[in-house]
């Protein structure tokens, strides 16, 4: 299932209502309006499914619906990453992909989607209310992180639900360049809104949409932060956790935001056998808005890298020293 | 600039256990996984496993589980290896290297150390 | 685990000419493979990754492909200091493998 949002249709205001330049005042705040909606909120979707043929498998599939650049996903279990969960999978577009057990394989499913399949027997098996995050960091987004679980009613071979709660969190990276030039269009437009209050606005239709487009959800901030303070994370049965095998398990990772090093002498090009699977049509998915932190009173686990990363096609070493000295 | 600095050669007797170590700066310690390689004389690269300098988490090739042990000490940034029961077969340059997500590219490397075996 | 073949063991050429090795794997990687460089008496120094990114600093005739399951690294006019050694690493998962190495060496 995928949430996409429902650009409004404008309807050009009635002829003769207004002259040349109270037509183009009209019309601007309509365009800051839809940009306002749509721009810099990308979506992450999680897929948990339990595969029919063993029952201990799962397969995790992860997409990012945005237009940024991906450049790092982790995948982790037991909640977010840096916030109690273990690290299964890190995957790197040019960089390589890491996976911890009971991870088996992790891959590039398209340019912006990931799978990773799960396998384990005994202390390491997963489980079916075991819950599995990914984490997009992409530029200029910044950090997106969505979480989903299968219920343990679920049948074999079935793909979860929609997860009924989004699990809020991300990080504070990514507003400041695209969302800032928003956020001043959006207050540009309440005070033209404010100014044309008297006057009739244009009537807005929504826009056409396939039978299979669920209604867009508008995440205002306040419902936002209403949201991350009320909706805590998943209560993960322990017996689920890894147990420690060849692995001891990274929890959290190290904070390599800052200091990741590109090495690239070019910009590199992705991995050269991107697979074309389409975004799956059902499955658990979760959006998480970007820059939650301040309105949710929460502090973010990792510097966010949209504040390092590196518009430079060179990548971070055009600005830093080796390995991003701080 | 980044440097990995590690410890001087060892001549150790068949069956002793030898501790060697790799001292990190120009960069945040914790930011980079440190992995160790073994090179036999005259021959090719075998990577020995990494360690998680956050946390301490290590992961180990089957090839060295028993043989090596991996660990940090934060407070210094420091990485070691202990490699014990050790065979002619031991002796070889050993190596650390710092690695950046997604911790599977030997980014810096150490100038190595040389292990000897011998009676 | 992944194993990486890799021709030829050695390697004699002279200074100005044109050189390629090769690397097979046993497995499919993507594109997740990266070459070393390692000089006489020195550390291994990452070179290229990714097929064909090279790293920061490296000289642009050093050029890496694919075809299949077999990468290649291309070296165009021969520098001095580009004799030594050259292994491929892949970078899809651990244990991190490497081939057996190619020793180029001036003819």
């Known amino acids: 299932m995928r949430t996409e949002a429902q650009v409004p249709a404008l309807q050009p205001p009635e002829p003769g209502l207004e002259g040349a330049m109270g037509h183009r005042t009209l019309v601007l705040p309509w365009v800051l309006l839809t940009l306002c909606v749509t721009a810099g909120t990308p979506e992450v979707w999680v897929q948990v499914r339990m595969e029919a043929t063993e029952l201990s498998s799962f397969t995790i599939r992860c997409g990012f619906l945005g237009s940024g650049s991906i450049s790092l996903v982790t995948v982790s279990w037991g909640g977010p990453n840096g916030a109690g969960g273990t690290t299964l999978a890190v995957l790197h577009p040019e960089r390589g992909i890491r996976q911890w057990a009971p991870a088996r394989q992790a891959r590039w499913e398209t340019q912006s989607s990931i799978s990773l399949i799960l396998e384990g027997s005994g202390a390491s098996s997963p489980c079916a209310n075991t819950t599995f995050c990914c984490k997009f960091a992409s530029f200029p987004e910044g950090s997106w992180e969505a979480c989903g679980s299968l219920p343990p009613s679920s049948d074999p071979g079935l793909s979860a639900p929609p997860t009924p709660a989004p699990i809020l969190r991300a990080d504070l990276a990514g507003i400041l360049g695209v969302s800032g030039v928003l956020l001043f269009g959006c207050v540009y437009l309440l005070h033209l809104l404010r100014r044309h209050k008297h006057r009739p606005a244009p009537r807005l239709q929504p826009s056409r949409t396939s039978p299979q487009a669920p209604r867009a959800r508008a995440w205002a901030p306040s419902q936002a932060s209403q949201a991350a303070l009320h909706v805590p994370y998943a209560t993960i049965n322990t017996s689920c956790r890894p147990a420690t095998l060849d692995t001891a398990h990274p929890h959290g990772g190290p904070s390599w935001w800052a200091s990741l090093p590109t090495h690239a002498a070019h910009r590199p090009q992705g991995p050269a056998a991107w697979a074309s699977t389409p975004i799956p049509a059902r499955g658990s998915f979760v959006s998480v808005e970007n820059g939650l932190y301040a309105q949710a009173g929460e502090r973010p686990p990792h510097t966010g890298p949209g504040l390092t990363l590196f518009p430079d096609p060179r990548g971070p070493r055009a600005m830093e020293g080796p390995l991003g000295v701080r | 600039e980044a440097q990995l600095q590690q410890s001087g050669p060892e001549l150790v007797k068949p069956g002793a256990s030898v501790k060697i170590s790799c001292k990190a700066s120009?960069?945040?310690?914790?930011?980079?996984?440190m992995n160790w390689v073994k090179q036999s004389h005259g021959k090719s690269l075998d990577w020995i496993g990494d360690?998680?300098?956050?946390?301490?988490?290590?992961t180990y090739n089957q090839k060295f589980k028993g043989k090596a042990t991996l660990t940090v000490d934060k407070s210094s940034s420091t990485a070691y290896m202990e490699l014990r029961s050790l065979t002619s077969e031991d002796s070889a340059v050993y190596y650390c290297?710092?690695?950046?997500?997604?911790?599977?590219?030997?980014?810096?490397w150490g100038q190595g150390t040389s292990v000897i075996v011998s009676s | 685990d992944i194993q990486m073949t890799q021709s030829p063991a050695s390697l004699s050429a002279s200074v100005g000419e044109t050189v390629t090795i090769t690397c097979q794997t046993s497995e499919n990687i993507y594109s997740y493979l990266a070459w070393y460089q390692q000089k006489q008496g020195k550390s291994p120094q990452l070179l290229v990754y990714n097929t064909q990114t090279l790293a920061e600093g490296v000289p642009s005739r050093f050029s890496g492909s694919r075809s299949g399951a077999q990468f290649s690294l291309k070296i165009n006019s021969l520098q001095p200091e580009d004799f030594g050694s050259y292994y491929c690493?892949?970078?899809?998962?651990?244990?991190?493998?490497f081939g057996a190495g190619t020793k180029l060496e001036l003819k």
């Open positions: 360690i998680n300098p956050d946390n301490g988490g290590s």
């Open positions: 690493q892949h970078h899809y998962g651990v244990p991190l493998t």
């Open positions: 290297s710092a690695s950046g997500p997604p911790y599977v590219l030997l980014d810096y």
């Open positions: 120009g960069y945040t310690f914790t930011d980079y996984y």
